[in-house]
Protein backbone atom coordinates (compact mmCIF):
# COMPACT_ATOMS: atom_id res chain seq x y z
CA UNK A 1 0.00 0.00 0.00
CA UNK A 2 1.29 3.42 -0.59
CA UNK A 3 1.98 5.79 1.44
CA UNK A 4 -0.12 9.00 1.02
CA UNK A 5 2.48 11.11 2.31
CA UNK A 6 4.96 10.45 -0.08
CA UNK A 7 2.58 12.39 -2.78
CA UNK A 8 3.79 15.22 -0.80
CA UNK A 9 6.26 17.33 -2.62
CA UNK A 10 8.92 19.29 -1.51
CA UNK A 11 7.74 22.69 0.28
CA UNK A 12 4.45 20.82 2.02
CA UNK A 13 4.22 18.59 4.26
CA UNK A 14 2.39 15.25 5.12
CA UNK A 15 -0.23 17.16 7.54
CA UNK A 16 -1.70 14.05 10.31
CA UNK A 17 -4.07 16.61 11.45
CA UNK A 18 -5.98 16.88 8.37
CA UNK A 19 -6.39 13.15 7.40
CA UNK A 20 -2.92 12.98 5.88
CA UNK A 21 -3.13 16.00 3.14
CA UNK A 22 -0.66 17.91 1.60
CA UNK A 23 -0.16 21.05 3.59
CA UNK A 24 2.17 24.16 2.28
CA UNK A 25 4.86 24.75 4.95
CA UNK A 26 4.11 28.11 7.00
CA UNK A 27 6.26 31.09 6.31
CA UNK A 28 10.25 30.49 8.17
CA UNK A 29 9.89 27.01 7.58
CA UNK A 30 10.71 24.74 4.80
CA UNK A 31 10.96 21.10 3.18
CA UNK A 32 13.67 20.19 0.81
CA UNK A 33 12.84 16.85 0.39
CA UNK A 34 8.66 14.98 -0.85
CA UNK A 35 6.69 13.24 1.96
CA UNK A 36 8.39 14.71 4.71
CA UNK A 37 5.61 14.78 8.11
CA UNK A 38 6.77 18.19 9.46
CA UNK A 39 8.75 21.37 8.09
CA UNK A 40 11.99 22.37 9.11
CA UNK A 41 12.40 26.03 10.96
CA UNK A 42 14.80 28.60 9.13
CA UNK A 43 18.14 29.08 10.04
CA UNK A 44 18.45 32.47 11.22
CA UNK A 45 21.36 34.50 9.97
CA UNK A 46 22.20 37.33 12.84
CA UNK A 47 24.91 38.39 14.59
CA UNK A 48 27.97 37.37 13.09
CA UNK A 49 26.19 35.50 10.92
CA UNK A 50 24.55 37.52 7.65
CA UNK A 51 22.34 36.25 5.08
CA UNK A 52 24.00 34.72 1.38
CA UNK A 53 20.77 33.01 0.25
CA UNK A 54 17.05 33.59 1.79
CA UNK A 55 15.08 30.75 3.09
CA UNK A 56 12.09 29.33 1.26
CA UNK A 57 9.49 26.91 1.04
CA UNK A 58 12.03 24.41 -0.53
CA UNK A 59 15.17 24.95 0.66
CA UNK A 60 16.91 26.36 3.70
CA UNK A 61 18.41 29.89 4.49
CA UNK A 62 22.02 29.80 3.78
CA UNK A 63 24.64 32.50 5.93
CA UNK A 64 27.81 33.83 5.71
CA UNK A 65 30.20 35.99 7.92
CA UNK A 66 29.89 39.84 8.34
CA UNK A 67 32.92 41.70 7.16
CA UNK A 68 36.23 41.02 9.63
CA UNK A 69 35.05 37.48 9.89
CA UNK A 70 35.34 33.98 7.88
CA UNK A 71 33.17 30.68 7.88
CA UNK A 72 34.14 27.61 9.84
CA UNK A 73 32.64 24.31 9.81
CA UNK A 74 29.98 22.99 7.25
CA UNK A 75 27.37 25.23 6.06
CA UNK A 76 29.12 28.15 7.80
CA UNK A 77 28.23 26.69 11.35
CA UNK A 78 30.41 29.36 13.02
CA UNK A 79 32.27 32.87 12.38
CA UNK A 80 35.76 33.13 13.49
CA UNK A 81 37.27 36.53 13.77
CA UNK A 82 39.84 37.67 10.93
CA UNK A 83 42.55 39.31 12.37
CA UNK A 84 44.82 41.92 11.42
CA UNK A 85 48.48 41.58 9.78
CA UNK A 86 50.57 41.82 12.72
CA UNK A 87 48.04 39.77 14.88
CA UNK A 88 47.17 36.48 15.57
CA UNK A 89 43.66 34.98 16.93
CA UNK A 90 43.66 33.57 20.60
CA UNK A 91 41.13 32.29 22.81
CA UNK A 92 40.66 35.98 23.73
CA UNK A 93 40.22 37.32 20.45
CA UNK A 94 42.92 38.99 18.08
CA UNK A 95 46.30 39.57 20.01
CA UNK A 96 49.16 41.81 18.45
CA UNK A 97 52.08 39.61 17.86
CA UNK A 98 55.24 39.86 20.42
CA UNK A 99 58.36 41.73 19.71
CA UNK A 100 60.76 39.54 17.27
CA UNK A 101 57.83 37.47 15.52
CA UNK A 102 55.29 38.95 12.96
CA UNK A 103 52.25 37.87 10.66
CA UNK A 104 52.21 39.19 7.62
CA UNK A 105 48.19 37.52 6.63
CA UNK A 106 44.66 38.01 8.43
CA UNK A 107 45.07 34.45 9.80
CA UNK A 108 47.59 32.44 10.81
CA UNK A 109 50.15 32.59 13.43
CA UNK A 110 52.67 35.10 14.61
CA UNK A 111 56.44 33.85 13.45
CA UNK A 112 60.01 34.40 14.81
CA UNK A 113 61.69 36.95 12.42
CA UNK A 114 64.12 35.42 10.64
CA UNK A 115 67.91 34.93 12.19
CA UNK A 116 69.72 36.51 9.72
CA UNK A 117 73.00 35.39 11.36
CA UNK A 118 72.23 31.84 11.38
CA UNK A 119 72.74 32.52 7.81
CA UNK A 120 75.63 34.58 7.81
CA UNK A 121 74.07 37.48 7.08
CA UNK A 122 73.11 40.84 8.42
CA UNK A 123 69.61 42.92 8.74
CA UNK A 124 69.51 45.30 5.87
CA UNK A 125 65.80 46.06 6.93
CA UNK A 126 64.65 45.85 10.61
CA UNK A 127 61.42 43.31 11.04
CA UNK A 128 58.11 44.69 12.61
CA UNK A 129 54.87 42.96 13.82
CA UNK A 130 53.36 42.70 10.02
CA UNK A 131 56.93 42.24 7.88
CA UNK A 132 59.43 39.94 8.56
CA UNK A 133 63.00 41.35 8.84
CA UNK A 134 65.04 41.22 5.78
CA UNK A 135 68.58 39.62 5.43
CA UNK A 136 71.37 41.55 3.30
CA UNK A 137 74.92 40.56 2.51
CA UNK A 138 76.91 39.38 5.66
CA UNK A 139 79.28 41.95 7.35
CA UNK A 140 82.18 40.32 5.59
CA UNK A 141 81.02 41.61 2.10
CA UNK A 142 80.65 44.45 3.43
CA UNK A 143 84.20 45.10 3.88
CA UNK A 144 85.28 49.65 3.31
CA UNK A 145 85.14 49.73 -0.41
CA UNK A 146 82.75 47.12 -1.12
CA UNK A 147 79.92 49.47 -1.03
CA UNK A 148 78.91 53.12 -0.41
CA UNK A 149 75.89 51.56 1.56
CA UNK A 150 76.41 51.96 5.20
CA UNK A 151 74.06 48.95 6.88
CA UNK A 152 71.23 49.97 8.99
CA UNK A 153 71.66 49.30 12.98
CA UNK A 154 71.17 45.07 13.10
CA UNK A 155 67.61 44.38 14.38
CA UNK A 156 67.33 42.53 17.85
CA UNK A 157 66.63 39.22 17.00
CA UNK A 158 65.11 36.36 18.61
CA UNK A 159 67.33 34.02 21.12
CA UNK A 160 70.24 36.83 20.20
CA UNK A 161 71.24 39.36 22.26
CA UNK A 162 72.84 42.64 20.97
CA UNK A 163 76.57 41.90 20.24
CA UNK B 1 6.59 38.28 -18.17
CA UNK B 2 3.01 40.53 -16.53
CA UNK B 3 0.29 40.68 -14.22
CA UNK B 4 -3.22 41.90 -14.68
CA UNK B 5 -6.23 42.70 -12.80
CA UNK B 6 -9.65 42.26 -13.56
CA UNK B 7 -13.25 41.93 -11.97
CA UNK B 8 -13.37 45.31 -10.91
CA UNK B 9 -16.93 46.83 -11.08
CA UNK B 10 -19.69 49.01 -8.91
CA UNK B 11 -21.48 46.86 -6.78
CA UNK B 12 -23.72 47.55 -4.07
CA UNK B 13 -22.67 47.11 -0.52
CA UNK B 14 -22.75 42.87 0.71
CA UNK B 15 -22.47 41.49 -2.47
CA UNK B 16 -19.50 39.42 -2.89
CA UNK B 17 -16.84 40.28 -5.67
CA UNK B 18 -13.94 38.50 -6.98
CA UNK B 19 -11.01 39.68 -8.59
CA UNK B 20 -8.58 38.19 -10.79
CA UNK B 21 -5.04 38.37 -11.22
CA UNK B 22 -3.50 36.30 -14.66
CA UNK B 23 -0.35 36.35 -14.68
CA UNK B 24 1.68 35.16 -18.37
CA UNK B 25 5.22 34.05 -18.59
CA UNK B 26 6.19 32.71 -15.14
CA UNK B 27 4.93 30.07 -12.89
CA UNK B 28 3.16 30.79 -9.96
CA UNK B 29 4.91 27.63 -8.33
CA UNK B 30 8.15 29.96 -8.57
CA UNK B 31 6.83 33.27 -6.92
CA UNK B 32 4.81 34.28 -4.51
CA UNK B 33 1.79 37.20 -5.24
CA UNK B 34 0.41 39.79 -3.26
CA UNK B 35 -3.00 41.66 -3.31
CA UNK B 36 -2.50 45.46 -2.05
CA UNK B 37 -5.69 48.13 -1.80
CA UNK B 38 -5.44 51.81 -2.75
CA UNK B 39 -8.66 53.99 -2.21
CA UNK B 40 -8.77 57.21 -4.08
CA UNK B 41 -6.39 59.70 -2.64
CA UNK B 42 -5.04 57.62 0.28
CA UNK B 43 -1.39 55.00 0.70
CA UNK B 44 -1.06 51.67 -0.24
CA UNK B 45 -3.01 48.79 1.57
CA UNK B 46 -1.42 45.21 2.07
CA UNK B 47 -4.20 42.61 1.96
CA UNK B 48 -2.74 39.45 1.64
CA UNK B 49 -0.60 36.92 0.19
CA UNK B 50 -0.24 33.47 -1.24
CA UNK B 51 3.33 31.93 -1.17
CA UNK B 52 5.19 29.63 -4.51
CA UNK B 53 3.75 26.38 -2.21
CA UNK B 54 0.38 27.84 -1.43
CA UNK B 55 0.40 29.05 1.55
CA UNK B 56 -1.98 31.99 2.00
CA UNK B 57 -1.64 34.47 4.66
CA UNK B 58 -3.79 37.60 5.02
CA UNK B 59 -2.97 40.79 7.00
CA UNK B 60 -4.20 41.18 10.52
CA UNK B 61 -6.76 43.82 10.00
CA UNK B 62 -8.92 41.34 6.99
CA UNK B 63 -10.72 39.41 9.89
CA UNK B 64 -12.31 37.18 7.09
CA UNK B 65 -13.22 40.54 4.75
CA UNK B 66 -11.21 38.96 1.81
CA UNK B 67 -10.24 35.38 0.75
CA UNK B 68 -7.40 34.79 -1.57
CA UNK B 69 -7.36 31.68 -3.27
CA UNK B 70 -4.90 30.39 -6.06
CA UNK B 71 -4.94 28.25 -9.86
CA UNK B 72 -2.13 27.11 -11.66
CA UNK B 73 -2.41 30.80 -13.89
CA UNK B 74 -4.99 32.91 -11.46
CA UNK B 75 -5.00 34.25 -8.12
CA UNK B 76 -8.34 35.19 -6.97
CA UNK B 77 -9.39 38.08 -4.45
CA UNK B 78 -12.71 38.00 -3.35
CA UNK B 79 -14.75 40.65 -1.01
CA UNK B 80 -16.90 38.54 0.75
CA UNK B 81 -18.94 41.26 2.02
CA UNK B 82 -18.14 44.83 0.51
CA UNK B 83 -18.58 47.85 2.10
CA UNK B 84 -18.06 51.73 0.83
CA UNK B 85 -14.47 51.10 2.80
CA UNK B 86 -13.42 48.84 -0.08
CA UNK B 87 -13.74 51.28 -2.86
CA UNK B 88 -10.27 51.60 -4.06
CA UNK B 89 -7.96 50.34 -6.47
CA UNK B 90 -6.73 46.97 -6.53
CA UNK B 91 -3.31 45.49 -7.10
CA UNK B 92 -1.59 42.25 -7.89
CA UNK B 93 2.02 42.02 -7.75
CA UNK B 94 4.90 39.50 -8.06
CA UNK B 95 7.23 38.56 -5.70
CA UNK B 96 11.25 38.98 -7.18
CA UNK B 97 12.08 35.45 -6.10
CA UNK B 98 10.55 32.73 -4.30
CA UNK B 99 12.04 33.22 -0.90
CA UNK B 100 10.01 34.08 2.35
CA UNK B 101 11.44 37.17 2.92
CA UNK B 102 10.92 38.85 -0.63
CA UNK B 103 10.10 42.11 -2.77
CA UNK B 104 7.75 43.12 -5.23
CA UNK B 105 8.82 43.92 -8.31
CA UNK B 106 6.18 43.31 -10.96
CA UNK B 107 2.96 44.87 -10.81
CA UNK B 108 -0.03 44.90 -12.36
CA UNK B 109 -2.00 48.24 -13.49
CA UNK B 110 -4.80 47.75 -10.86
CA UNK B 111 -8.82 47.29 -11.25
CA UNK B 112 -11.13 49.56 -9.48
CA UNK B 113 -13.74 48.29 -7.40
CA UNK B 114 -16.78 51.16 -6.25
CA UNK B 115 -18.97 50.02 -3.33
CA UNK B 116 -22.25 52.09 -3.47
CA UNK B 117 -25.77 51.68 -2.96
CA UNK C 1 1.38 43.49 13.66
CA UNK C 2 4.67 45.31 12.32
CA UNK C 3 3.69 49.12 11.81
CA UNK C 4 5.43 51.60 9.15
CA UNK C 5 5.79 54.93 10.36
CA UNK C 6 7.01 57.45 7.71
CA UNK C 7 7.63 61.29 7.47
CA UNK C 8 7.43 63.60 6.16
CA UNK C 9 3.96 63.03 5.00
CA UNK C 10 5.06 65.55 2.52
CA UNK C 11 8.19 67.19 1.35
CA UNK C 12 9.19 70.35 -1.24
CA UNK C 13 11.93 70.58 -2.75
CA UNK C 14 13.72 71.97 -5.54
CA UNK C 15 15.37 70.95 -8.67
CA UNK C 16 18.90 70.14 -8.23
CA UNK C 17 18.26 69.80 -4.52
CA UNK C 18 17.95 66.60 -2.00
CA UNK C 19 15.12 65.15 -0.07
CA UNK C 20 15.52 62.45 3.40
CA UNK C 21 12.47 60.14 3.73
CA UNK C 22 12.52 58.55 7.03
CA UNK C 23 10.58 55.24 7.48
CA UNK C 24 10.48 53.66 11.09
CA UNK C 25 9.39 50.21 11.95
CA UNK C 26 7.79 49.36 15.17
CA UNK C 27 10.05 46.07 15.35
CA UNK C 28 13.25 45.45 13.98
CA UNK C 29 13.08 44.17 10.70
CA UNK C 30 16.81 43.60 10.01
CA UNK C 31 17.00 44.98 6.08
CA UNK C 32 14.30 43.67 5.06
CA UNK C 33 12.76 46.74 3.89
CA UNK C 34 11.76 47.91 0.13
CA UNK C 35 11.08 51.51 -1.29
CA UNK C 36 8.82 52.14 -3.93
CA UNK C 37 7.53 55.23 -5.74
CA UNK C 38 4.32 55.27 -7.75
CA UNK C 39 2.86 58.51 -9.80
CA UNK C 40 -0.68 58.86 -10.09
CA UNK C 41 -3.07 56.48 -12.04
CA UNK C 42 0.30 54.37 -12.15
CA UNK C 43 1.09 51.10 -10.18
CA UNK C 44 4.12 51.32 -8.02
CA UNK C 45 7.82 51.24 -9.22
CA UNK C 46 10.09 49.36 -6.91
CA UNK C 47 12.99 51.76 -6.72
CA UNK C 48 15.42 49.60 -3.60
CA UNK C 49 14.97 46.53 -2.09
CA UNK C 50 17.42 44.96 0.89
CA UNK C 51 16.99 48.51 2.60
CA UNK C 52 20.14 49.69 0.06
CA UNK C 53 20.16 47.96 -2.82
CA UNK C 54 19.13 49.55 -6.20
CA UNK C 55 16.63 47.76 -8.22
CA UNK C 56 17.84 47.00 -12.05
CA UNK C 57 17.27 50.52 -13.92
CA UNK C 58 16.72 52.90 -11.52
CA UNK C 59 18.83 55.99 -11.17
CA UNK C 60 21.82 55.86 -8.53
CA UNK C 61 20.46 59.21 -7.21
CA UNK C 62 18.37 57.22 -5.05
CA UNK C 63 19.59 55.46 -2.24
CA UNK C 64 18.85 53.63 0.52
CA UNK C 65 20.33 53.20 4.25
CA UNK C 66 19.33 51.66 7.43
CA UNK C 67 18.95 48.57 9.37
CA UNK C 68 16.87 47.48 12.06
CA UNK C 69 13.95 49.64 12.68
CA UNK C 70 15.41 53.43 11.23
CA UNK C 71 15.60 53.97 7.59
CA UNK C 72 15.78 56.36 5.42
CA UNK C 73 15.77 57.14 1.57
CA UNK C 74 17.84 59.69 0.37
CA UNK C 75 17.32 61.68 -3.47
CA UNK C 76 19.77 63.79 -4.88
CA UNK C 77 20.14 65.39 -7.18
CA UNK C 78 16.01 66.35 -7.78
CA UNK C 79 15.01 66.07 -11.23
CA UNK C 80 11.16 67.22 -12.19
CA UNK C 81 10.15 63.37 -12.83
CA UNK C 82 10.80 62.61 -9.47
CA UNK C 83 7.57 64.15 -8.00
CA UNK C 84 5.86 61.22 -6.98
CA UNK C 85 4.38 59.80 -3.54
CA UNK C 86 7.70 57.08 -2.00
CA UNK C 87 6.58 54.18 -0.09
CA UNK C 88 8.41 51.68 2.67
CA UNK C 89 7.18 48.57 2.73
CA UNK C 90 8.72 45.62 5.32
CA UNK C 91 9.42 42.29 3.50
CA UNK C 92 10.15 40.72 6.98
CA UNK C 93 8.01 37.55 6.54
CA UNK C 94 8.53 36.34 9.67
CA UNK C 95 8.07 38.67 12.50
CA UNK C 96 6.73 37.22 16.13
CA UNK C 97 3.43 38.29 14.12
CA UNK C 98 4.26 36.82 11.25
CA UNK C 99 2.75 40.12 9.22
CA UNK C 100 5.57 41.32 6.97
CA UNK C 101 4.02 43.16 4.10
CA UNK C 102 2.79 46.22 5.94
CA UNK C 103 3.49 49.70 4.01
CA UNK C 104 4.76 53.09 5.06
CA UNK C 105 1.93 56.00 5.22
CA UNK C 106 3.69 57.53 2.22
CA UNK C 107 5.44 60.87 1.42
CA UNK C 108 4.68 63.06 -1.63
CA UNK C 109 7.54 64.38 -2.80
CA UNK C 110 6.46 67.77 -5.14
CA UNK C 111 9.57 69.28 -6.77
CA UNK C 112 9.43 73.15 -7.45
Known amino acids: LQDPCSNCPAGTFCDNNRNQICSPCPPNSFSSAGGQRTCDICRQCKGVFRTRKECSSTSNAECDCVPGFRCLGAGCAMCEEYCQQGQELTQKGCKDCCFGTFNDQKRGICRPWTNCSLDGKSVLVNGTKERDVVCGPSPADLSPGASSVTPPAPAREPGHSPQ | QSVEESGGRLVTPGTPLTLTCTVS????????MIWVRQAPGKGLEWIGVVYDNGYISHATWVKGRFTISKTSTTVGLEITSPTTEDTATYFCARSADGSWSTYFNLWGQGTLVTVSS | DIVMTQTPASVEAAVGGTVTIKCQAS??????LAWYQQKPGQPPKLLIY???TLASGVSSRFKGSGSGTEFTLTISDLESADAATYYCQTNYCCSSSDNGFAFGGGTEVVVK
Open chain 3, 27 to 32: ESISNY
Open chain 2, 25 to 32: GFSLSTYA
Open chain 3, 50 to 52: KAS
